[in-house]
């Protein structure tokens, strides 16, 4: 799997999980989240060469198409596969509220 | 939806469905498929600017992050959303066989 265990341990130019820390205030302009101040969002990036972690039949076909037609621009792309939620604390007035924001953290990637 | 109805009608630099015809023999080296000789596989390509058809909370966050940090390399990517199967005819010796190959045709795209 193209997850932290694999990607953060290996220097990989191909599609892999990349570390990305997002500071809510500085990077998103969000002042409403009290805790945490930021989080490890991560992101997916890198080349999708021939059949590198291809996700669907179509992406495998596209990968094969690209190998045989190297001048083609139709190549698979490195995107998130598994996502996890993030629990945040914010205030409505003076009242604290805990909320779970879905699909905020990328855990693994794929070529799609 | 970033489908044929929208994308094939508009000239769009942003993430959209692009037409791609694949000839099985010429483009994939597949001699075993008898019919069809090829098919409209399509593919997804184009930029994913701020909130352009963002798929998940993470891709929306990443989109916003990129707007505030334009030098960042962490941007969403244009990938397939809805896929459809393709029915093929091939031969086992002289005996014809019909098979449905799943996820062979891209019908729409998203920024993920």
């Amino acid at each position: 799997a193209l997850d932290a265990a694999y990607c953060f341990r290996n220097v990989q130019d191909n599609c892999c999980l990349r570390p990305l820390y997002i500071d809510f205030k500085r990077d998103l302009g969000w002042k409403w989240i009290h805790e945490p101040k930021g989080y490890n969002a991560n992101f997916c990036a890198g080349a999708c060469p021939y059949l590198w972690s291809s996700d669907t039949q179509h992406s495998r076909v596209l990968s094969l198409y690209n190998t045989i037609n190297p001048e083609a621009s139709a190549s698979p792309c490195c995107v998130s596969q598994d996502l996890e939620p993030l629990t945040i604390l914010y205030y409505i007035g003076k009242t604290p509220k805990i909320e779970q924001l879905s699909n905020m953290i990328v855990k693994s990637c794929k070529c799609s | 939806a970033l489908d044929a109805a929208y994308c094939f009608r508009n000239v769009q630099d942003n993430c959209c469905l692009r037409p791609l015809y694949i000839d099985f023999k010429r483009d994939l080296g597949w001699k075993w498929i008898h019919e069809p000789k090829g098919y409209n596989a399509n593919f997804c390509a184009g930029a994913c600017p701020y909130l352009w058809s963002s798929d998940t909370q993470h891709s929306r966050v990443l989109s916003l992050y990129n707007t505030i940090n334009p030098e960042a390399s962490a941007s969403p990517c244009c990938v397939s959303q809805d896929l459809e199967p393709l029915t093929i005819l091939y031969y086992i010796g002289k005996t014809p066989k019909i098979e449905q190959l799943s996820n062979m045709i891209v019908k729409s795209c998203k920024c993920s």
Partner: antibody
Framework: QVLLVQSGADVRKPGASVKIFCKAS????????MHWVRQTPAQGFEWMGS????????TYARRFQGRLVLTADTSTNTAYMELRSLKSADTAVYYC?????????????WGQGSLVTVSS | EIQMTQSPSSLSASPGDRVTITCRAS???????LAWYQQKPGKVPKLLIY???SRAPGVPSRFSGSGSGTDFTLTISSLEPEDAATYYC?????????FGQGTKLEIK
């Protein structure tokens, strides 16, 4: 040049399973159908089945149906043959072979063979 | 399943001889679903002829194939010492693919 490199010789007990790999190089693995054939002095050549990479369509000889699994890993250009519930009659040299293109076809390149001995 | 019967099962011939091996199918294969292979002791089979009469790349022109329906032949027009081997026919008109029992060719 086209090369099909198979795993080495193996000894198995009756009732066990064996899995042989066939690593392809020198051509576009996903464009060709891969076959498995075995050879014994008594039976000669016996075709076992074929697998089409990417789409994972496997065709099996009826006599092996139910205990043979053919797969192809396109990420490593490797085909696999797993034969279960082994009997002494399964002692043979097992070959992977690439076809000229059709599901059933002539086989233009063969692996070096993997000897499997089934003995208690 | 289609049975493939080769004849003769063995033969001995001299360099320069013309040699013919026949293969009979238990049912019609049509005109192009037959292949011929050469196998030397301890070696892997080598494709000689496919589609009943098409020579595989790199195969010397002294090897030729003919036939259709149920009767097929492999001909070596002028035997060379390196042609000593066992020759097999194979049908791929129907599943399962089946092979002949082999013809062992010895050079005198």
């Amino acid at each position: 040049q086209v090369l099909l490199v198979q795993s080495g010789a193996d000894v198995r007990k009756p009732g066990a399973s064996v899995k042989i790999f066939c690593k392809a190089s020198g051509y576009t693995f996903s464009s060709n159908v891969m076959h498995w054939v075995r050879q014994t002095p008594a039976q000669g050549f016996e075709w076992m089945g074929s697998v089409i990479p990417i789409v994972d369509i496997a065709t099996y000889a009826r006599r092996f149906q139910g205990r043979l699994v053919l797969t192809a890993d396109t990420s490593t250009n490797t085909a696999y043959m797993e034969l279960r519930s082994l009997k002494s009659a399964d002692t043979a040299v097992y070959y992977c072979a690439r076809t000229l293109g059709l599901v059933l076809d002539a086989m233009d390149y063969w692996g070096q063979g993997s000897l499997v001995t089934v003995s208690s | 399943e289609i049975q493939m019967t080769q004849s003769p099962s063995s033969l001995s011939a001299s360099p320069g001889d013309r040699v013919t091996i026949t293969c009979r199918a238990s049912q019609s294969l049509g005109s192009s679903y037959l292949a011929w292979y050469q196998q030397k002791p301890g070696k892997v089979p080598k494709l000689l002829i496919y589609g009943a009469s098409s020579r595989a790349p790199g195969v010397p022109s002294r090897f030729s194939g003919s036939g259709s329906g149920t009767d097929f032949t492999l001909t070596i027009s002028s035997l060379e010492p390196e042609d000593a081997a066992t020759y097999y026919c194979q049908q791929y008109a129907d599943s399962p693919i089946t092979f002949g029992q082999g013809t062992k060719l010895e050079i005198k």
